[in-house]
Amino acid sequence: YKAEVTVSQVYSGSLRVLNRHFSQDLGRRESIAFRSESAKAQKMLQELVASTRLGTYYNSSSVYSFGEGPLTCFFWFILDIPEYQRLTLSPEVVRELLVDELLSNSSTLASYKTEYEVDPEGLVILEASVNDIVVLNSTLGCYRYSYVNPGQVLPLKGPDQQTTSCLWHLQGPEDLMIKVRLEWTRVDCRDRVAMYDAAGPLEKRLITSVYGCSRQEPVMEVLASGSVMAVVWKKGMHSYYDPFLLSVKSVAFQDCQVNLTLEGRLDTQGFLRTPYYPSYYSPSTHCSWHLTVPSLDYGLALWFDAYALRRQKYNRLCTQGQWMIQNRRLCGFRTLQPYAERIPMVASDGVTINFTSQISLTGPGVQVYYSLYNQSDPCPGEFLCSVNGLCVPACDGIKDCPNGLDERNCVCRAMFQCQEDSTCISLPRVCDRQPDCLNGSDEEQCQEGVPCGTFTFQCEDRSCVKKPNPECDGQSDCRDGSDEQHCDCGLQGLSSRIVGGTVSSEGEWPWQASLQIRGRHICGGALIADRWVITAAHCFQEDSMASPKLWTVFLGKMRQNSRWPGEVSFKVSRLFLHPYHEEDSHDYDVALLQLDHPVVYSATVRPVCLPARSHFFEPGQHCWITGWGAQREGGPVSNTLQKVDVQLVPQDLCSEAYRYQVSPRMLCAGYRKGKKDACQGDSGGPLVCREPSGRWFLAGLVSWGLGCGRPNFFGVYTRVTRVINWIQQVLTHHHHHH
């Protein structure tokens, strides 16, 4: 005889009792009323199961909570099912069996019916696991039930001091959705908060789980698919203060069925968003947007932020949102890169875009900007990267497109192409009043607007000029003079420079900043405007360094161990990290610090010039890095501000040296022998290049490298021209914020 193999199947759910009412006492597990009612309700549940063919499999059950409606019982039960029947007893089948029993008139074994009038319609049965029950049981010492009335913002009481795990069981009116707001009040903690689209902590109904005080999302709002949610907290380390604040609201279902007609222009025309954006989208989200385009000359571009779409096999669920665009199924996924989906127009009736959440696990709300593009010329003067839908500079020596096609088939790479014979001349020789091309095409159209391209400078009126790097060179090249605006920058305070020396003199690098915590130099930076210092995002990598309040910025400083009259200090009012910064890859390694009060410029304190996106820093050019970093690998920081000249390195040469880990947002500089390099403590400091006008432009920020000054391993810097749009955006947006 062989014993039958059984498996324990766990079910979780709720049922509504019509002849009972919820009372506050029933909401407290420690009350006598709760103990008495839960014992009776459990007996009722056991009898209900026993009245069906499931009775033979019954193992155990528990009614662990009560809620409104008139009285809702929340329970779990375990059935020991023969292995061969496991798949046939799905939650749907179990629910059907129990509903049939509730609707039947048979009086056998139905003593539970005399005391409890159970609403068959309201029976909910979900699949659970033994682990879910373990998690649930671990929270029972700190189990909080709350009913959320419409219109109220209900603050939830924080965890009890002595507990290690708590569960907030949230319920609202049937026709509304639960929305939870979680705000981290500290920067470092090891707590875990998980939110579930169910009354209990069912792994299969997890909406999101956050570990540690999330710096990326200090405040998050999360939607359930309906009127129930469970929030579970697990303690990380002992702390007297709660590391978070929780509040909850019941909100109406928001429709996202939209019909839009676009105008015949190429700028951004609006956005599509998931309901309650920027809240996490709900597990029940289904949006349908119909966009009508004015003519077939245009295509539709959807501009995503830190989210992208890709093809996925039909048998695979989309875990971060499913998109249907013109009958093409695409899956969304979060990414630290920009992305555009381009939809070519083939029919005049426009395009329908559907967004659906296929699983309970969701993510931050999705916002998509939309615009039209010219189907015959989608990227004027640039290259359309089919991998990510973006327009990128072509033939500039930097592979912006992941497949590198923007640098293929180039007649001239990072050079000017003569019209006469397709020879290439160096960019500084264009519009320099000296013909270099055979028929002088490099000196034509220098006084008029030209089509915009990779190396043309875009004036404020959006026209472009042919002369490379025309900013602040003392000559007005734009019709509107915008190339000579904002030019109070890039001039050294003192003319005597110690050429070839290592120690800097006062006023030599007046934009140099020292970023300090409690009097200790941590990183370098550069002054770029009267309230703004730029530095590297990785300086704020550690949780203990993430708060702006900790930092002091020194400008005009020369020596770390002493102060002198030329230096000034500032507190930091706000810190902006590039949203795409990725610690592991060092990509987008840039941050902006807003100072608590404006800087008064002097001979020793003044900003460096910011390059335009089109500014070209030529490989082979000699530039300078400055900082108080270590003078040898592993050494202490320097007392006196050091300077060193380095040479800009062709991107592919550096990429080879670093096994292709160098992104388009990175720039390499150094010394093939090694020796001359940035080091620990220089991070975030400026790499500056002098233009023929005598002004210094910010080419890079000290970011990373293998060791310091090692042969064949150059220093890697954040390429400022590739993050300048973000810099300008932050500066413009937060100009008046004090």
């Epitope: 020596g397 790479r413 490989p619 380095v646 062709p650 042969p711």
Partner: antibody, heavy 118, light 107 residues
Framework: EVQLQQSGAELVKPGASVKLSCTAS????????IHWVKERTEQGLEWIGR????????TYAPQFQGKATIIPDTSSNTAYMQLSSLTSEDAAVYYC???????????WGQGTSVTVSS | DIVMTQSHKFMSTSVGDRVSITCKAS??????VAWYQQKPGQSPKILIY???TRHTGVPDRFTGSISGTTYILTISSVQAEDLALYYC?????????FGGGTKLEIK
């Protein structure tokens, strides 16, 4: 003024070795790479290899591996190149030159003529 | 190894003429190409590096340019003292390689 002064012409027997010197003035060889280049009539210029005198790290062209050995003497600001097992193929003018950063060779010595004859 | 090919061993020109000497690289060396001038009995002298950058003291009649993977040294108005042997060299990766040289002669 930057100068690279090379040793005088050499007449050597087949199978023998020769050591050529290159003394720098006007700069410190430790801050630069020192290269050696071979020139044969009708054959043009051939890069032999280079040394970083600061740490002695060398790089050679494959065809000169085992043939040439470059060594520095930082105390005398001099770089040497030894050529071994000489044959008539090694008869040429040898130049030393310096380079910095990623740049090519900007200053060259006057050259040393090596004749291989029995 | 990267092969640098100077297809013309000799080029004839007259004083005052514009002349272009070419050099083709077997693979992409970005702009890491130098040009040297060598006169009889002398060592090579650098004229151009990074394909287009003139070395200090080099007359501005010498310019460097590129066409695809072909690197060009142009002398806008040939002077008598420019008659010499011209070499290109890639300084992109070791082993550094030279072109075979082009001898500029007077017609």
């Amino acid at each position: 003024e930057v100068q690279l002064q090379q040793s005088g012409a050499e007449l050597v027997k087949p199978g023998a070795s020769v050591k050529l010197s290159c003394t720098a003035s006007g700069f410190n060889i430790e801050d630069y790479y020192i290269h050696w280049v071979k020139e044969r009539t009708e054959q043009g210029l051939e890069w032999i290899g280079r040394i970083d005198p600061e740490d002695g790290e060398t790089t050679y062209a494959p065809q000169f591996q085992g043939k040439a050995t470059i060594i520095p003497d930082t105390s005398s600001n001099t770089a040497y190149m030894q050529l071994s097992s000489l044959t008539s193929e090694d008869a040429a003018v040898y130049y030393c030159a310096r380079s910095i950063y990623l740049d090519p060779m900007d200053y060259w010595g006057q050259g040393t003529s090596v004749t291989v004859s029995s | 190894d990267i092969v640098m090919t100077q297809s013309h061993k000799f080029m004839s020109t007259s004083v005052g003429d514009r002349v272009s000497i070419t050099c083709k690289a077997s693979q992409d060396v970005t702009t890491a190409v130098a040009w040297y001038q060598q006169k009889p009995g002398q060592s090579p002298k650098i004229l151009i590096y990074w394909a287009t950058t003139r070395h200090t003291g080099v007359p501005d009649r010498f310019t460097g340019s590129i066409s695809g993977t072909t690197y060009i040294l142009t002398i806008s108005s040939v002077q008598a003292e420019d008659l010499a042997l011209y070499y290109c060299q890639q300084h992109y990766s070791t082993p550094y390689t030279f072109g075979g040289g082009t001898k500029l002669e007077i017609k």
